[in-house]
């Protein structure tokens, strides 16, 4: 398993929400993206393909989230300051093998005016 | 380890039909597609239907479409296939095989179908 | 469909001897950098067992005297010498669109 922290953008506010990009490589196939709080998964999209190619997308903790051909989007509305915590992004890569597990992430930080409903 | 265990299979008149059924054990069942593959006697390989990991999406061969139902039972570990219709052709071995994401890695025994008045 | 043809249909070789078995597909199997091409081992009344998956990847546990090769169209396994337990049926199978396909396999046996 490889720890680090994401060596990208990994959070994008926009309209009181925050966009968490996963990003993995483009050689991968197949895999799973979990998205943690903490220890906490908060959301999961699974991509596999069967013996015709044809590709299944499954999420057992459904949020919002959005499939490129290298990163996984999870969106977060409704922004407060209890969402102010570590996030990580759980790859696993089942295809091409060997199956790998690794785990990216970075603190995101709630300020007021990325609030959704600030009191004016 | 895999075992895959397949049941169901016997003599059957043409166009009668049969539910053949295969017990998964040692892997997380619900995490992968399962096939059927079948083999005529003396012959080749023949693919005949897949399924993804719940139900959803199902694929077949252009041979048994409209004829042939496959299934899953995620809380048994259990694969069906429901055979109508059957045709001496359809006769063989009968194969349920996992994907392993890129090839069919784990097989059972088969069980043999024999379609004959 | 995609159609796998196999050459030859059969072939008797010499134990310790090399052998090659080829495989040909009616268009290419190649997407982006994998090869959709599969190689199954099947011995005398059992179930077909995985030997080679993205044309060259040998799976764990099968011995290193079976490889793969090939790209796009043409494909080949090859046995570097070949031993008794090795008497079985071959066979490519392509997994790059619905529906999968095998070649009609490739019977080899010990002269």
């Known amino acids: 398993e490889i720890n680090g922290s994401a060596n990208y953008e990994m959070f994008i506010f926009h309209n009181g929400g925050v966009q968490i990009l996963c990003k993995y490589p483009d050689i991968v196939q197949q895999f799973k993206m979990q998205l943690l709080k903490g220890g906490q998964i908060l959301c999961d999209l699974t991509k596999t393909k069967g013996s015709g190619n044809t590709v299944s997308i499954k999420s057992l903790k459904f949020c919002h989230s959005q499939l490129s051909n290298n990163s996984v989007s999870f969106f977060l509305y409704n922004l407060d300051h209890s969402h102010a915590n570590y996030y990580f992004c759980n790859l696993s890569i089942f295809d091409p093998p060997p199956f790998k597990v690794t785990l990216t992430g970075g603190y995101l930080h709630i300020y007021e005016s990325q609030l959704c409903c600030q009191l004016k | 380890e895999v075992q895959l265990v397949e049941s169901g299979g016997g003599l059957v008149q043409p166009g009668g039909s049969l539910r053949l059924s295969c017990a998964a054990s040692?892997?997380?069942?619900?995490?992968?597609?399962m096939d059927w593959v079948r083999q005529a006697p003396g012959k080749g390989l023949e693919w005949v239907s897949n399924?993804?990991?719940?139900?959803?999406?199902?694929e077949y061969s252009p041979f048994v479409k409209g004829r042939f139902t496959i299934s899953r039972d995620n809380s048994k570990n259990t694969l069906y296939l429901q055979m109508n219709s059957l045709r001496a052709e359809d006769t063989a071995v009968y194969y349920c095989?996992?994907?392993?994401?890129?090839?069919?890695?784990?097989w059972g025994q088969g069980t043999l179908v024999t379609v004959s008045s | 469909d995609i159609v796998m043809t196999q050459s030859p249909d059969s072939l008797a070789v010499s134990a310790g001897e090399r052998v090659t078995i080829n495989c040909k597909s009616s268009q290419s199997l190649l997407s982006g950098s994998f090869n959709y091409l599969t190689w199954y081992q099947q011995k005398p009344g059992q179930p077909p067992k995985l030997l080679i998956f993205?044309?060259?990847t040998r799976q764990t546990g099968v011995p290193d005297r079976f490889s793969g090769s090939g790209s796009g169209t043409d494909f080949t396994l090859t046995i570097s010498s070949l031993q008794a337990e090795d008497v079985a049926v071959y066979y490519c199978?392509?997994?790059?669109?619905?529906?999968?396909?095998f070649g009609q396999g490739t019977k080899l046996e010990i002269k």
């Open positions: 199978h392509h997994h790059y669109n619905a529906p999968p396909t």
């Open positions: 399924i993804d990991e719940d139900g959803s999406i199902a």
């Open positions: 040692g892997f997380t069942f619900s995490d992968y597609w």
């Open positions: 095989s996992r994907w392993g994401r890129f090839a069919f890695d784990s």
């Open positions: 993205y044309a060259s």
